[in-house]
């Protein structure tokens, strides 16, 4: 006769492991008992259990409640046992020793491999600001057994670097994603992808990039200078910029206070019916937590009763 077993049995942490040991004997042969032992114990073989043909399953106190026979129906030549709720410490070599009559004893070894799936974590780097050089966007760490694979899925251009730390029964892998921040990256997803044989599918953690920036400011509304004449209604100036975080707007007049009746509504400066008193230099001040910008325009309100020509200058400063 001969023993049938597996070279390697692989289970995920917390699952039950079936340790197979089947005696394929000749006609008339019987199994008296099957002894299971840890074969890699430093102080020699440590008995797990003994399956006796007459007196049943004997379990080592160290494995009390964790070693069982497979559910019925059972073949008297089957010495397989179930190891409940596998933990990392169970990983190692096991020996099955089958005592038969009249053929004698047979033994076989198998390796139990316990997969520990990772629980990945993603940590964003420091605040990203346009104008910075190569900067850490995020790091992703996953620990498991065996070592997990950590990669990145993103449309953003960047560089990755990985390092691994080995522990006694597992390994931690950390991958960093570096980039040169630009406003086009704002709102883009950066996804950490963790692969591991103990996972049914890859684990993904997504981080949305936030890059602080503030665009140059400009003022619209003076494109047709002929419209800025005494008596015109609905004249307005609009300050244009964009930023992250979204900027706030403030309007001032360089050569004095804002004329009465002029309304400030965020990025828009609204005028009452125009008079020559509305002529002057207006400044739009745009700011967010990252930076600030100014843009100024000169308004000349034309009085048709005057023959003098009109002139409008646009100046932008930051």
């Amino acid at each position: 006769g001969e023993l049938e077993t597996s070279d390697v049995v692989t289970v995920v942490l917390g699952q039950d492991a079936k340790l197979p040991c089947f005696y394929r004997g000749d006609s008339g042969e019987q199994v008296g008992q099957v002894a299971w032992a840890r074969a890699d114990a430093g102080e020699g073989a440590q008995e797990l259990a003994l399956l006796h043909s007459k007196y049943g399953l004997h379990v080592s106190p160290a494995y009390e409640g964790r070693v069982e026979q497979p559910p019925p129906p059972r073949n008297p030549l089957d010495g397989s046992v179930l190891l409940r709720n596998a933990v990392q410490a169970d990983e190692g070599e096991y020996e099955c020793r089958v005592s038969t009559f009249p053929a004698g004893s047979f033994q076989a070894r198998l390796r139990l491999r316990v997969l520990v799936p990772p629980l990945p974590s993603l940590n964003p780097g420091p605040a990203l600001e346009e104008g910075q050089g190569l900067t850490l966007a995020a790091s992703c760490t996953a620990e498991g057994s065996p070592a997990p694979s950590v990669t990145w899925d993103t449309e953003v251009k960047g560089t990755t670097s990985s390092r691994s730390f080995k522990h006694s029964r597992s390994a931690a892998v950390t991958s960093e994603f570096h980039l040169v921040p630009s406003r086009s990256m704002n709102g883009q997803p950066l996804t950490c992808v963790v692969s591991h044989p103990g996972l049914l599918q890859d684990q993904r953690i997504t981080h949305i990039l936030h890059v602080s920036f503030l665009a140059e400011a400009s003022v619209r509304g003076l494109e047709d200078q002929n419209l800025w004449h005494v008596g015109r209604e609905g004249a307005m100036l609009k300050c244009l910029s964009e930023g992250q975080p979204p900027p706030s707007y403030n309007w001032t007049r360089l050569d004095g206070p804002l004329p009465s009746g002029v309304r400030v509504d965020g990025d828009t400066l609204g005028f009452p019916p125009l008079t020559t008193e509305h002529s002057g230099i207006y400044v739009c001040h745009v700011s967010n937590e990252f930076s600030s910008r100014d843009s100024q325009v000169t308004v000349d309100v034309l009085d048709p009763q005057e023959d003098s020509g009109k002139q409008v200058d646009l100046v932008s400063a930051s």
């Epitope: 008995e47 797990l48 003994l50 006796h52 007459k54 007196y55 004997h58 080592s60 106190p61 009559f101």
Partner: nanobody
Framework: EVQLVESGGGLVQAGGSLRLSCAAS????????MGWYRQAPGKLRELVAS???????WYVDSVKGRFIISRDSAKNTVYLQMNSLKPGDTAVYYC????????????WGQGTQVTVSS
């Protein structure tokens, strides 16, 4: 030839404890299993607990959580610690040994009486 000698029996009140000992001598290296049987008057002898050379144990359902079988290889002795005893545990307790390859308990002690009063 293996010889088995039990001790530790006696009279105890319900809820009390006793510790039985079984000292083995002779060809002890031939022993595969050792166990404790009991036989109450008018009843069949039943296996209560057994222990392997490697220390793995088996218990009959009625004593699980109350009885503990253990062994001291240096002293060639097997023990049965009996806690939370009940009147139904009253019986003669026998130590038994199974020789390697026999697959049945084939060596017996003389027995020790355990009486649990209510």
């Amino acid at each position: 030839e293996v010889q088995l000698v039990e001790s530790g029996g006696g009279l105890v009140q319900a809820g009390g404890s006793l510790r039985l000992s079984c000292a083995a001598s002779g060809s002890i290296f031939d022993i595969n299993l050792m166990g404790w049987y009991r036989q109450a008057p008018g009843k069949l002898r039943e296996l209560v607990a057994s222990i392997t050379r490697g220390g793995s144990t088996w218990y009959v359902d009625s004593v699980k959580g109350r009885f503990i079988i253990s062994r001291d290889s240096a002293k060639n002795t097997v023990y049965l610690q009996m806690n939370s005893l009940k009147p139904g545990d009253t019986a003669v307790y026998y130590c038994a040994a199974e020789s390697i390859g026999s697959y049945t308990f084939d060596r017996w002690g003389q027995g020790t009486q355990v009486t649990v009063s209510s």
